[in-house]
Amino acid sequence: EEELQVIQPDKSVSVAAGESAILHCTVTSLIPVGPIQWFRGAGPARELIYNQKEGHFPRVTTVSESTKRENMDFSISISNITPADAGTYYCVKFRKGSPDTEFKSGAGTELSVRAKPS
């Protein structure tokens, strides 16, 4: 089996303020078992946007049914985008453990926010 890759096909996405942003992410393998997390930014100061395993993320919904068998699509939609949401978003695969540990990150998708049309 080939090692899992995290694919973020869009290098950049532009969304009008007030709209929803869809950030695409797929993985190429069911192995290893473990959750997906989304972050804005990289490094120690990165901001958690969504954690498949736990947490409450009222503005975030998953695009596909992530509980379904053989699902490899972990794209998310973020509602009511504001200029403060601009940044680079990373889809990160974690490996099951105590605690779960980071396994591989996607290349990132840069979100830019356009002014709300008048």
Epitope: K53, E65, S66
Partner: antibody
């Protein structure tokens, strides 16, 4: 950490019903399947059924399809397994188990609930 | 329905020696490029513990003396050097369709 806490032991008479609960913590309950498995004294493991708490999709072992019902309460992160028309050979430890990879496998287990069926 | 048959039913192995448990499926459990076989260890009075998933992948925290192999219909769980704490009953499970378990193999120390 993931925890599945099951309800206490039950003693039932033949023909009665039992409802076993499994309270989940340490993860988002609606994001992972829950399986139910039983083990009669000194015997092997027998898969009963599974439920997706996000939409209540269920799959049942044909042997239990007419007697078992799985439900969830997402407000309390609790899964339930009801077994009706109990017989003496339903005496077993009943386990709930969470499927962390949507592989129809059982990654994390509760400690089990002993159900004794005796007249 | 796919039936899993484990062999042997019981096994006694000396400490430090290799233990091998087999699991044969009545039809192939390979689908979408994966072998849908899992191995569990159950010690007395405890729930089962997942050891191996998708035939050959060790679960988190499982010692590397445990390994899984096989494809299609024939699968093996190997313990390369038996330790006292490995005494248990071992079960295979498939999920090519809805799950079923093998009947179990009891592993003891010789």
């Amino acid at each position: 950490q993931v925890q599945l806490v099951q309800s206490g032991a039950e003693v039932k008479k033949p023909g009665a019903s039992v409802k076993v609960s499994c309270k989940a913590s340490g993860y988002t309950f609606t994001n992972y399947w829950i399986n139910w498995v039983r083990q009669a004294p000194g015997q092997g493991l027998e898969w009963i059924a599974m439920i997706d708490p996000s939409d209540s999709e269920t799959h049942y072992n044909q042997i239990f399809k007419d007697r078992a019902t799985l439900t969830t309460d997402t407000s309390t992160s609790t899964a339930y397994m009801e077994l009706r028309s109990l017989r003496s050979d339903d005496t077993a430890v009943y386990y709930c188990a969470m499927d962390y990879g949507s592989l129809y496998a059982m990654d994390y287990w509760g400690r089990g609930t002993l159900v004794t069926v005796s007249s | 329905d796919i039936v899993l048959t484990q062999s042997p039913d019981s096994l006694a192995v000396s400490l430090g020696e290799r233990a091998t448990i087999n699991c044969r499926a009545s039809q192939s459990v390979r689908s979408s490029g994966y072998n849908w076989i899992f191995w569990y260890q159950q010690k007395p009075g405890q729930p089962p513990k997942l050891l191996i998933y998708l035939a050959s992948n060790r679960d988190s925290g499982v010692p590397d003396r445990f390994s899984g192999s096989g494809s299609g219909t024939d699968f093996t769980l190997t313990i390369s050097s038996l330790q006292a704490e490995d005494v248990a009953v071992y079960y295979c499970q498939h999920s090519r369709e809805l799950p079923t378990f093998g009947q179990g193999t009891k592993l003891e120390i010789k």
